[in-house]
């Protein structure tokens, strides 16, 4: 075993030597000799016995997407992207890995979930944890003070995910953010509007968007007697209230985080409250909370936000929830999280949340962390938790036993007799050139029944059948797969007829 490990190390070292010689542009003979040595070392390694025991699987917390799952995913993305574009967003992309330094100190307690890469020639790198910090880095690096952008990409977290609930270590985020100095709460309200539009369009069930403000939380902690140094850690405890009872949260704050029980009780009086604009009004009258500058600012902004949400017609979807304390260090103002609601067992019960499907908030200080002069660019944004949405949509389709098409083929070019491969190839090429999504079976003389069966399985709506008689007459038999009716279409009219039947625009503009 030790011998094998030594050989493996030698193979690695020799490989590095060969690469080094190539970079140094060493003599061809020397490179050739060192490559020959490398091959001899590899030959000595022989087959790895452990390879026989190797279980083929994807790494923990990851999955492949089958064509069926990809079809679902593309539909979901399509809804999201159309909404983002409707709201005037541009699109950007950033590297999948960032300098470790870029990500450090931005995520608080979640920093332990960042994937670090092994040293790649001097640069300490980490896989991105979200799309927000790279966005802030992008703004600072390019000295941008104003942009509305969306970004859809994979992010990585060393979580212990419950994949059945749509949680992964590699997953997509769909982010929309507005950066720039604007009048209070207008961009924030638009972000919430976008969130509601997307969740409604996806038809994944009833949802509720919880809203809070970091300043209200911080003010509340201050008046309850939490020391500054404990704010962030107590935040992460409070944020668990949607999953566990107040008693459990209190035990964690007192037992694990060293908070005095009376301080925890004072916090409990606040964080168990949720409601609408009336709760904002009520807290503005709170003798202690209204005396705290930060909390007062936050409450004032929330009051304004609710006005705009009413104008946008989504105030019925929003709940002011004092327990919402999203666990990311960079939020500075309004924070929000959308949860899907399960239908309660009995009428009169409160709807139950089944996990976050979208979230976001205001982060006015993040860009400043990257700017040498600390210049701030106010930002607000949202992130759609598409992995959870994919899971929900997939489950719904399975329950409905709905057939999902995994291709967009409009027509199969088929033949009824033998020796018509050339004609099929010519016709399919004509269709492709005209922008028609077409296929043919890769056989010289396929049976007509097999060709029709293929259409049934793949959900292809039309078959263009070539026969010797049709060739003589200059027509193509166009068959509807579902109704089985056939009509002869003049070859020159075929493209137009297919487009008409499949609802495709007549020109590829």
């Amino acid at each position: 075993m030790a011998e094998r490990a030594a050989l493996e190390e030698l193979v690695k070292l020799q490989g590095e030597r060969v690469r080094g010689l190539k970079q140094q542009k060493a003599s061809a003979e020397l490179i050739e000799e060192e490559v020959a040595k490398l091959l001899k070392l590899k030959a000595q390694l022989g087959p790895d016995e452990s390879k026989q025991k190797f279980v083929l699987k994807t790494p923990k917390g990851t999955r492949d997407y089958s064509p069926r799952q990809m079809a679902v995913r593309e539909k979901v993305f399509d809804v999201i992207i159309r909404c983002f574009k409707r709201h005037g967003a541009e699109v950007i992309d950033t590297p999948v890995f960032e300098l470790k330094e870029t990500l450090m100190g931005k995520y608080g307690e979640d920093s332990k979930l960042i994937y670090d890469l092994k040293d790649q020639g001097g640069e300490l790198l980490s896989l991105r944890y979200d799309l927000t910090v790279p966005f802030a880095r992008y703004l600072a690096m390019n000295k941008l003070t104003n942009i509305k952008r969306y970004h859809i990409a994979k992010v990585y977290r060393r979580d212990n995910p419950a994949m059945t609930r749509g949680r992964y270590r590699e997953f997509y985020q769909c982010d929309f953010d507005i950066a720039g100095n604007f009048d209070p709460m207008i961009p924030d309200a638009e972000c919430l509007k976008i969130m509601c539009e997307i969740l409604s369009s996806l038809q994944i069930g009833d949802f509720l968007v919880k809203v809070n403000d970091r300043r209200i939380l911080d003010g509340m902690f201050a008046i309850c007697g939490v020391s500054d140094s404990k704010f962030r850690t107590i935040c992460s405890s409070v944020d668990k209230l949607d999953k566990v009872s107040w008693e459990e949260v209190k035990n964690e704050m007192v037992g694990e985080k060293g908070l005095a029980p009376e301080v925890a009780d004072r916090i409990g009086d606040y964080v168990q409250q949720h409601g609408g604009v009336s709760l904002v009004e009520q807290l503005l009258q709170d003798p202690k909370l209204s005396q705290n500058k930060q909390a007062l600012e936050g409450l004032g902004d929330l009051k304004l936000l609710f006005e705009y949400l009413t104008l946008f017609g989504i105030d019925d979807k929003i709940s002011f929830d004092l327990s919402l304390a999203r666990g990311l260090d960079y939020y500075t103002g309004v924070i929000y999280e959308a949860v899907l609601l399960q239908t309660p067992a009995q009428a009169g019960e409160e709807p139950l949340g089944v996990g976050s499907v979208a979230a976001g908030g205001r982060y006015d200080g993040l860009v400043g962390m990257f700017d040498p002069k600390g210049r701030k660019v106010p930002c607000v944004g949202l992130s759609i938790g598409v992995e959870r949405i994919f899971s929900i949509v997939e489950q719904r389709l399975e329950a409905l036993e709905e057939k999902i098409r995994t291709t967009e083929t409009q027509v199969l070019v088929a033949s009824a007799q033998k020796k018509l491969l050339e004609e099929r190839l010519k016709l399919v090429s004509e269709l492709w050139d005209a922008g028609i999504k077409a296929e043919l079976l890769y056989k010289k003389n396929p049976k007509l029944l097999n060709q029709l069966q293929y259409c049934e399985e793949a959900g292809i709506p039309l078959v263009a059948i070539i026969g010797e008689q049709e060739l003589k007459d200059g027509v193509i038999k166009l068959r509807s797969v579902t109704s089985r009716e056939e009509v002869d279409v003049r070859r020159e009219d075929l493209v137009e007829e297919i487009k008409r039947r499949t609802g495709q625009p007549l020109c590829i503009c």
Partner: antibody, heavy 120, light 107 residues
Framework: QVQLVESGGGLVKPGGSLRLSCAAS????????MSWIRQAPGKGLEWVSY????????NYADSVRGRFTISRDNAKNSLYLQMNSLRAEDTAVYYC?????????????WGQGTLVTVSS | DIQMTQSPSSVSASVGDRVTITCRAS??????LAWFQQKPGKAPKLLIY???NLESGVPSRFSGSGSGTDFTLTISSLQPEDFATYYC?????????FGQGTKLEIK
């Protein structure tokens, strides 16, 4: 077990020639790079020359280049060092050595050495 | 050519002592380093290869470490049979060169 036995050493006058041989056994000789390493009396070790398994590649220390020739006969499991134009500074014990893992320039197995003395 | 410098050139120690010998390369050699032990009138014997791999049959009290330019050979607890001369050798590029040797003597 691996055995390397050198022969051919002796006393020779400056400018003279000698041919050292190394008989190998206990391993597949034709798989291995081989080398000659020498050690002057009371001094350190010096890598003189090496030859690849198929004789395609050879190399020499600057101090012997043009005067010494390394060769091998895989059929006879033998390694050779032809030494011409010998100098007093070539006086040393000459070791035949087998590479580590066939191609790694670290002498895993050594012969007992053969003494070459160049003196008038 | 790559120069290999060993230190110290000689060291006196007692049975049971921990001894460290260092070897410095004039330029980076990655892990391409070996350590040999030689006793008078005998051929050298390979102890450690590629900086830290123990040759089979060599007692575990011998260990090697380092990469780049600085390397060490450590004998954790000297035994009577360990008194000898030790050489390091770089196998990074030809001409392969040895250190001048470190003589380990009984105190």
């Amino acid at each position: 077990q691996v055995q390397l036995v050198e022969s051919g050493g002796g006393l020779v006058k400056p400018g003279g020639s000698l041919r050292l041989s190394c008989a190998a056994s206990g391993f597949t000789f034709s798989d291995y790079y081989m080398s000659w390493i020498r050690q002057a009396p009371g001094k350190g070790l010096e890598w003189v020359s090496y030859i690849s398994d198929s004789s395609r590649y050879t190399n020499y220390a600057d101090s012997v280049r043009g005067r010494f020739t390394i060769s091998r006969d895989n059929a006879k499991n033998s390694l050779y060092l032809q030494m011409n134009s010998l100098r007093a500074e070539d006086t040393a014990v000459y070791y035949c050595a087998r590479y580590l893992y066939q191609v790694i320039a670290i002498a895993k197995s050594w012969g007992q050495g053969t003494l070459v003395t160049v003196s008038s | 050519d790559i120069q290999m410098t060993q230190s110290p050139s000689s060291v006196s120690a007692s049975v049971g002592d921990r001894v460290t010998i260092t070897c410095r390369a004039s330029q980076g050699i990655s892990s391409w380093l070996a350590w040999f032990q030689q006793k008078p009138g005998k051929a050298p014997k390979l102890l450690i290869y590629v900086a830290s791999n123990l040759e089979s049959g060599v007692p575990s009290r011998f260990s090697g470490s380092g990469s780049g330019t600085d390397f060490t050979l450590t004998i954790s607890s000297l035994q009577p049979e360990d008194f000898a001369t030790y050489y390091c050798q770089q196998a990074n590029s030809f001409p392969y060169t040895f250190g001048q040797g470190t003589k380990l003597e009984i105190k």
